[in-house]
């Protein structure tokens, strides 16, 4: 029989880790098997940043220094699996470490808010409630968003007020609106580290109403009423 080199279970191993991970944290692992059933010793090659160490027996990879996303992500190193005993044949795979921002996802609207309308003309200032979300994992508390108007020019017509960490109220400041669609830009800040902002748009239509619904010519869907 010809002795064969160990075989990695994957061509490339990829792991994602937050850049502020504590030194000594397990950031990934690799696995290989030897066709002859010999034990395998793992080692790293090309760890030029000196960030990683590998357990020679288990293939687990740990951080040994602070990780810096600004140095470039992904960080790629080679992983070597060598037979213990026998001919000491070896195989090489790659380990890619993707460094994540501590706070990676900007806030956004929780659902589709197209179709918002007020009946024109307004008899009194109106308001509507909207919800924000993001795709970050909030491990110890829910999101705590803050809300503001997306541009100064909107402040004459609109105001936004926070209800809780995820909901806010958009209110009209007066009743003198034209019969048309207004696009209100809302700035949502997640207060994370680093803080991320999303600018979202709420399209609000002022329209003539029939029986509480926006009047539209045949073929147009009714809008949803908010007041």
């Amino acid at each position: 029989d010809v002795n064969e080199a160990p075989q990695f279970s994957q061509h490339v191993f990829q792991a994602k880790v937050s850049e502020d991970v504590a030194i000594g944290t397990k950031v990934g692992n690799v696995t290989a098997k030897d066709p002859e059933g010999l034990d395998i010793s793992y080692s790293l090659r090309g760890d030029t940043r000196g960030w990683l160490k590998i357990d020679h027996v288990t293939g687990e990879i740990f951080s040994v220094a602070p990780l810096d996303r600004e140095a470039g992500s992904p960080y790629r190193v080679q992983v070597v699996a060598t037979e213990v005993g026998g001919s000491s044949l070896s195989s090489v795979s790659e380990f890619h470490l993707i460094l994540m921002d501590v706070n990676d996802n900007p806030p956004r609207l929780a659902k589709d808010y197209t179709g918002l309308f007020f009946c024109h003309p307004l008899s009194a200032p109106g308001s509507l409630i909207f919800e924000a979300t993001d795709d970050d994992q909030h491990l110890f508390r829910g999101p705590h968003f803050t809300f503001s108007l997306g541009s100064g020019s909107l402040q004459n017509d609109w105001e936004v007020s926070k209800i809780n960490g995820t909901h806010a109220r958009l209110s009209t400041r007066h009743t003198e609106f034209e019969e048309r669609e207004y696009v209100v830009l809302i700035r949502i800040n997640d207060g994370g580290r680093p803080p991320l902002e999303g600018i979202v748009s709420l399209p609000v239509t002022f329209c003539s109403c029939v029986e509480g619904s926006c009047f539209r010519p045949a073929g147009h869907k009714h809008h949803h009423h908010h007041h």
């Epitope: 994602k16 090309g46 470039g72 992500s73 790629r76 080679q78 790659e94």
Partner: antibody
Framework: QVQLVQSGAEVKKPGASVKVSCKAS????????MNWVRQAPGQGLEWMGA????????NYAQKFQGRVTMTRDTSTSTVYMELSSLRSEDTAVYYC????????????WGQGTLVTVSS | DIVMTQSPDSLAVSLGERATINCKSS????????????LAWYQQKPGQSPKPLIY???TRESGVPDRFSGSGSGTDFTLTISSLQAEDVAVYYC?????????FGGGTKVEIK
């Protein structure tokens, strides 16, 4: 063989949002990153961001942070790219592009979706 | 971000002649960890999606004719079409896949002289 089939052309008004889909077939969906690249008329290619379907991790180009959201549905092997607060400069062909084997070049491309933003 | 600069912007070459496109990166694309250059080349014909030609600076995608070759290392790269064919008329882009965010060169338009 690998196929990426995108949703049809869209016309949107400034301030609106658009959601483009990209249905993948011919490979294991969760094994490869999916990227979104756009091309304005007569212009070059611009990377917007990527999603790893295995865990929903996203990486967005700074220019689009706050306006773009990439999601995936593993039950239908489909990725989505939503771009909000549209402006006329967002008029472009939007491509989904699958990552290569073992790294991150763009090995397979969708047919493109033209998004026109006009008042 | 890594800036990719292509030259020339356009190129007119006679059929059967050699076409050479250059791509310069603002950062080293050679990984000391893997000894690979993370640079790809794409071809885009009018009205079509881009098509990958080369990755890792010199590895041809399957099905790409061998008249296309990539070379270079570090910050300076070249795509060569050894004998230009009519069907090679297109815009060619380089792209770095070393570090996020992935970035493209501005493109080089290749035409028949």
């Amino acid at each position: 063989q690998v196929q990426l089939v995108q949703s049809g052309a869209e016309v949107k008004k400034p301030g609106a949002s658009v959601k483009v889909s990209c249905k993948a077939s011919g490979y294991t969906f969760t094994d490869y990153w999916m990227n979104w690249v756009r091309q304005a008329p007569g212009q070059g290619l611009e990377w917007m961001g990527a999603i790893d379907p295995s865990d929903r991790y996203t990486n967005y180009a700074q220019k689009f942070q706050g306006r773009v959201t990439m999601t995936r549905d593993t039950s239908t092997s489909t990725v989505y790219m939503e771009l909000s607060s549209l402006r006329s400069e967002d008029t472009a062909v939007y491509y989904c592009a699958r990552g290569g084997y073992g790294d991150y070049w763009f090995a397979n491309w969708g047919q493109g979706t033209l998004v026109t933003v006009s008042s | 971000d890594i800036v990719m600069t292509q030259s020339p912007d356009s190129l007119a070459v006679s059929l059967g002649e050699r076409a050479t496109i250059n791509c310069k990166s603002s950062q080293n694309l050679l990984s000391s960890g893997t000894q690979k250059n993370y640079l790809a080349w794409y071809q885009q014909k009018p009205g079509q999606s881009p098509k990958p030609l080369i990755y890792f600076a010199s590895t041809r995608e399957s099905g790409v004719p061998d008249r296309f070759s990539g070379s270079g290392s570090g910050t300076d790269f070249t795509l060569t079409i050894s004998s230009l064919q009519a069907e090679d008329v297109a815009v060619y882009y380089c792209q770095q896949h070393h570090y996020f965010p992935w970035t493209f060169g501005g493109g080089t338009k290749v035409e028949i002289k």
